[in-house]
């Protein structure tokens, strides 16, 4: 079976809840691909070590992405 026919998405549930950027250890944005037909956002939480799936369409999550990219652009020279 060609790999392109093997759907392997990471997220089967998605959270709409706001996430405090300070509580994030890592934020991964996985673009849609031949393996998974949709964008997936995975937040690794500092305290719990939990990898949580976030809803890319949620207003709260879009705001989180803006806040994180703003923070990153501040840090980069």
């Amino acid at each position: 079976v060609p790999l392109s026919r093997t759907v392997r998405c990471t997220c089967i549930s998605i959270s709409n809840q706001p996430v405090n950027p300070r509580s994030l250890e890592k934020l991964e944005i996985i673009p849609a691909s031949q393996f998974c037909p949709r964008v997936e956002i995975i937040a690794t939480m500092k305290k719990k070590g939990e990898k949580r799936c976030l809803n890319p369409e949620s207003k709260a999550i879009k705001n989180l992405l803006k806040a994180v990219s703003k923070e990153r652009s501040k840090r980069s020279p």
Epitope: I12, S13, K48
Partner: antibody
Framework: QVQLVQFGGGVVQPGRSLRLSCAAS????????MHWVRQAPGKGLEWVAV????????YYADSVKGRFTISRENAKNSVYLQMDSLRVGDTAVYYC?????????????WGQGTMVTVSS | SSELTQDPAVSVALGQTVRITCQGD??????ASWYQQKPGQAPVLAIY???NRPSGIPDRFSGSSSGNTASLTITGAQAEDEADYYC???????????FGGGTKLTVL
Amino acid sequence: QVQLVQFGGGVVQPGRSLRLSCAASGFTFSSYGMHWVRQAPGKGLEWVAVISYDGSIKYYADSVKGRFTISRENAKNSVYLQMDSLRVGDTAVYYCTRAGYSTDWHPDYWGQGTMVTVSS
Amino acid sequence: SSELTQDPAVSVALGQTVRITCQGDSLRSYYASWYQQKPGQAPVLAIYGKNNRPSGIPDRFSGSSSGNTASLTITGAQAEDEADYYCNSRDSSGNHVVFGGGTKLTVL
């Protein structure tokens, strides 16, 4: 509070079909993946199938692939398990469960279970 | 699909500490979750992720993992902890879920 109420089940002959349903309440159903898990009498838990929050992705245990179909209707806050070509070995209590947000897909809340008996 | 292996039965004296283990290759990639099941009842989530307890689960329950082994520890076991305990994780293939065979805990 989160509630998963199951319907269906009963006694059915080998080769016949049965449809289980699970009505969810107390949470945003359209954000959660859902599992079906079964337990044969006196045995352990066996995962059966999972469906993603939007119904676009479905995975099945090898033991039921091609015979069982998982589906959902987000407008009705319901998930279903269509069981065709039933075998004696499918006799079990079937549980509907919600999948947590984490990438390990752990079931967090469970329905009360419904008994399916396949017997001639 | 990969397997999770548990000891079929474990016993503990009332008030003592007991550890229930779960082994499997998938635990190198995914955290285990732990479920408590009492006779005639649906399973209840006891521990998930790194070491997270849902509300209502007493703090005597804790989880840990190392390599391909996950553990559920009950510190100061109570009579009401007597039950079957199942571990669970996402399969290493990524598109299945697997349960351990279960451990029957007896509190003496």
